[in-house]
Interface confidence: low
């Protein structure tokens, strides 16, 4: 059994000033979601990621970038699996509110409107202010009426049928919401509408099927509505089943879809004894032959530091179903083989998510990686280069003596991903190169001095400092840096005078 | 509310180097979401983009201009950096800073950087 | 580099009409492409975010539609504070780029 998620802010609600931007996280011990005030076409402004941490947890992130009256509401954090049609969400929940001056009351939906009454029970006029210290009266033909009052969900009590008016004062300003309409309904008979399609998207020439089912009514009224209804394209059905309860099943069947067959398919429901009248919704898409559009979250050129663990993932939408690849240097990524994993995984009925793992990255993981989508209607590819990090090492350090000229060159090679900066250093008294103030940059501009690199390939390099001629004992250092790391090592260059008299003793 | 405010000497030398500073307030640079990029406006032309970085250093440069420019984030003062070496009179512009997630939502107000000796 | 090529360069329009700008892209770019307006002397301000979808703030007459290669930017019934710079951008294909612009001005 899970524990329930947490919120940060760990607060009951919080009052969030307008047009300034708030995140919620959630964190969970399986994978979380949200669930919040506004629909999907209002929530341009409402972005969900996740974030990871070291605390084992799941952590996902809620962010608004511009507080509005809209985003007033219940906040809810949950785990996924846990999520069912029949249940109240079951979560950890946070309630903002968002104060507007000229928004006395959360927008609503027209059906928010119609409240039902079922027998004598008690009902909610939801008419919730966007500042929780705002005083709110009800009123209805005779008056204002007695009810309590909860900011997060409106007035709760026992009405009797007809129109009722909420009313606000907010900074001398007076607020009126549009009349809630109570209606009372037995409850036997409420309408009990399911919308289904197995699928939303199709491509020219396929059969879209699409069926409303009412459930426990046998006295209803369907009609369709669908972008062919004019030319009496579609074919309707129905089926009445009876076992273990009364279930009467619409069917509309579209067959050789065409493009302007895309839009809303809409059932309405109305009971033939009663105006109850229930409006189910879906969009249909018909594409005149199949797509693949990939889009990647990473840029064409990708850098990795050495042993990190790193993630590329590729959003692709696609219909048919794409089959999803992986290749690197344009041969197909053995698995095995290496430390790198791919996985697909399907998100929405069109969506697939791809990722590219690289375990503990190494050298030999640079290079050009490529996904590649298709279907039977389209191919689609997305190529990056991926450049593995490495911190600078010094290959070798030597010295090359000029004979009798005293001239001497020192060759110092190193190797890095960015490809290393060489830097020399001389320490000219041999005695104190113990000491680092001993030791001088060597500046290219020193007479009787040369300093020159050479690029061996893209991840090696050669420098070269050049002495004229060296009258006495110095150290010479190389440092080769990038920006993962620095490496120096040292070497004694003696003069040729005192090398011949060491030669004869 | 994030505010983006672009700094630094509004006259270059010709074959000098060119560096701005952008100052990010009201939300954090190091914000795993979003890239900080740098576009700049010749008088009277359209937008060229230069090059972003993310937090964490990484940067992306616009080919035209890669060998002469460098971009760099210093987290601790919630600011980021655009060098542009050799300059010439062609690099004479407006330069914005701005913050972006594939698309620009935040900018800077401008900065005029004039290439003349 | 992908390439965005914006038609009209200039418009000259009365109040209260509807202007079309287009855009269009070298090369497919999905529906990563956003539209930019700017006022003389301001910085350009996010308008429309991929192709169609609407930005917090921005006035209703504003609106995108479009995928692929070709991408338009309406604004319906043109009001005197509109007068400015419309630019497309892209962001699917490294390096981005902008169209030339598309000066609006105000009969």
């Known amino acids: 059994q899970l524990s329930l998620p947490s919120i940060l802010p760990n607060e009951n609600e919080k009052v969030v000033q307008l047009n300034s931007s708030f995140s919620l996280r959630c964190f969970g011990e399986s994978e979380v979601s949200w669930q919040y005030p506004m629909s999907e076409e209002e929530s341009s402004d409402v972005e969900i990621r996740n974030e990871e941490n070291n605390s084992g947890l799941f952590v996902t992130v809620l962010e608004v970038s511009s507080a509005s009256a809209a985003h007033t509401g219940l906040y809810t954090c949950y785990y996924n699996h846990t999520q069912t049609e029949e249940n109240e969400l079951e979560g950890r929940h946070i309630y903002i509110y968002v104060p507007d001056p000229d928004v006395a009351f959360v927008p609503l939906g027209m059906t928010d409107y119609l409240v039902i009454v079922e027998d004598d029970d008690s009902a909610i006029i939801p008419c919730r202010t966007t500042d929780p210290e705002t005083p709110v009266t009800l009123h209805n033909s005779e008056g204002v009426v007695p009810a309590s009052y909860d900011s997060r969900q409106g007035f709760n009590g026992t009405f009797t049928v007809g129109p009722y008016i909420c009313e606000a004062t907010v900074k001398g300003k007076k607020f009126q919401t549009i009349p809630f309409n109570v209606y009372a309904l037995k409850a036997t008979s409420e309408l009990d509408l399911e919308m289904e399609a197995l699928k939303t998207v199709y491509k020219s020439g396929e059969t879209i099927v699409v069926t409303c089912a009412v459930f426990n009514n046998e006295v209803v009224d369907l009609q369709w509505t669908y972008p062919g209804e004019v030319k009496g394209k579609g074919i309707t059905m129905l089926e009445e089943i009876k076992v273990p309860s009364i279930k009467l099943v619409y069917t509309l069947t579209v067959p050789e879809a065409t493009v302007k067959d895309s839009g809303d398919y809409e059932c309405a429901a109305r009971q033939a004894t009663r105006e109850v009248k229930e409006m189910k919704k879906v969009t249909i898409s018909v594409h005149e032959k199949g797509f693949i559009e990939i889009k990647p979250t990473f840029s064409q050129l990708e850098a990795v530091n050495l042993h990190e663990v790193k993630h590329f993932v590729v959003e692709v939408r696609a219909y048919p179903p794409p089959r999803i690849s992986w290749l690197k240097n344009n041969l197909t990524l053995i698995e095995n083989l290496t430390e790198i994993t791919t996985d697909v995984e399907k998100i929405q009925e069109i969506r697939y998510r791809s990722k590219l793992k690289l375990i503990r990255a190494k050298e030999e993981d640079s290079g050009h990686y490529t996904i590649v989508a298709q279907n039977e209607d389209a191919v689609k590819s997305y190529t990056f280069e991926l450049l593995t990090q490495v911190p600078s090492s010094i290959l070798d350090l030597v010295d090359d003596h000029h004979g009798s000229t005293g001239g001497q060159t020192v060759r110092c090679t190193a190797e890095g991903t960015p490809l290393p900066d060489i830097e020399w250093m001389i320490c000219k008294d041999i005695k104190k190169c113990n000491n680092e103030t001993s030791w001088t940059i060597l500046a290219n501009n020193v007479s009787n001095i040369i300093t020159e690199i050479h690029s061996r390939d893209r991840s090696t390099v050669e420098g070269r400092v050049t002495f004229a001629k060296v009258e006495e004992t110095i150290a010479v250092r190389c440092l080769a840096k990038n920006l993962l790391g620095a490496e120096n090592r040292e070497l004694k260059l003696v003069a040729p005078t005192l090398r011949s008299e060491l030669t004869v003793a | 509310q994030l505010q983006l405010q672009e700094s630094g000497p509004g006259l270059v030398k010709p074959s000098e180097t060119l560096s701005l500073t952008c100052t990010v307030s009201?939300?954090?640079?190091?914000?795993?979401?979003?890239?900080w990029g740098w576009i700049r406006q010749p008088p009277g032309k359209g937008l060229e983009w230069i090059g972003t970085?993310?937090?964490?250093?990484?940067?992306y440069y616009n080919p035209s201009l890669k060998s002469r420019v460098t971009i760099s984030v210093d987290t601790s003062k919630n600011q980021f950096s655009l060098k542009l070496n050799s300059v010439t009179a062609a690099d004479t512009a407006v330069y914005y800073c701005?913050?972006?997630?594939?698309?620009?939502?935040?900018w800077g107000q401008g900065t005029l950087v004039t290439v003349s000796s | 580099e992908i390439v965005l090529t914006q038609s009209p360069d200039f418009l000259s329009v009365t109040p209260k009409e509807k202007v079309t700008i287009t855009c269009r892209a070298s090369?497919?770019?999905?529906?990563?492409l956003h539209w930019y307006q700017q006022k003389p002397d301001q910085s350009p301000n996010l308008l429309i975010k991929?192709?169609?979808q609407s930005v917090s703030g921005v006035p209703s007459r504003f609106s995108g539609s479009g995928s692929g290669t070709d991408f338009t930017l309406t604004l319906n019934s043109l009001e005197a504070e509109d007068a400015a710079t419309y630019y497309c951008h892209q962001s699917t294909i490294l390096p981005w780029t902008f169209g030339q612009g598309t000066k609006v001005e105000i009969k």
């Open positions: 970085i993310y937090y964490s250093g990484s940067t």
């Open positions: 009201g939300g954090s640079i190091s914000s795993s979401t979003y890239y």
């Open positions: 701005a913050r972006h997630h594939w698309v620009f939502d935040y």
């Open positions: 991929y192709a169609s």
């Open positions: 090369q497919i770019i999905g529906s990563s």
